[in-house]
Amino acid sequence: MMTGTIETTGNISAEKGGSIILQCHLSSTTAQVTQVNWEQQDQLLAICNADLGWHISPSFKDRVAPGPGLGLTLQSLTVNDTGEYFCIYHTYPDGTYTGRIFLEVLESSVAEHGARFQIP
């Protein structure tokens, strides 16, 4: 039975040319996290494997930095970065937990962070 929950940074916005940290946190489970995948729509951005460490997709290597923690930092943001991002926690023995973040990249200098929310 999967008892865990993923808390994410929720709906967030950032300025074009800036950077943003995508964060997820898995709680309420004793399952072992074997790997975390970060995906944008259907594209794999990066993985953090418990044994092998961080590996960033070559397509995003110039603009994606690992961390902090199991989070992911996106740099040199463009309007095209607007969209859904997913943190996918592969765990044992629970299975897979997925968190969703919506990022809006704004042209203006008014970019305020949304509130946190929980995905059961």
């Epitope: 494997n49 092998l52 590996h55 960033i56 897979t96």
Partner: nanobody, 118 residues
Framework: EVQLVESGGGLVQAGGSLRLSCAAS????????MGWFRQAPGKEREFVAA????????NYADSVKGRFTISADNAKNTVYLQMNSLKPEDTAVYYC???????????WGQGTQVTVSS
Amino acid sequence: EVQLVESGGGLVQAGGSLRLSCAASGFIFDSYAMGWFRQAPGKEREFVAAISWGGSNTNYADSVKGRFTISADNAKNTVYLQMNSLKPEDTAVYYCAAVRITDGRDYWGQGTQVTVSS
């Protein structure tokens, strides 16, 4: 069926070099991250080095940085571990691992013995 076959181990004097190979079959190479681990007698298996996405990512354990180099030949589906300036504490059975990028599932080779004499 995923298969990993290590080779290249042996006995070498301290300060010497060895090159380990891991020949992989049964999967699409680019879909996996490949790693080397080692286990010394009476100790837990420990991470040594990893490589992924055709060599665009490499990670190393602090204890081997600057001495060991991991590389991959995608055409041959083979991963290498070049080990220089070997020390007696590098003595261990070295294992190759393949980790599926999509979900973290791992596969292991049988290991190859490396012995560094002083």
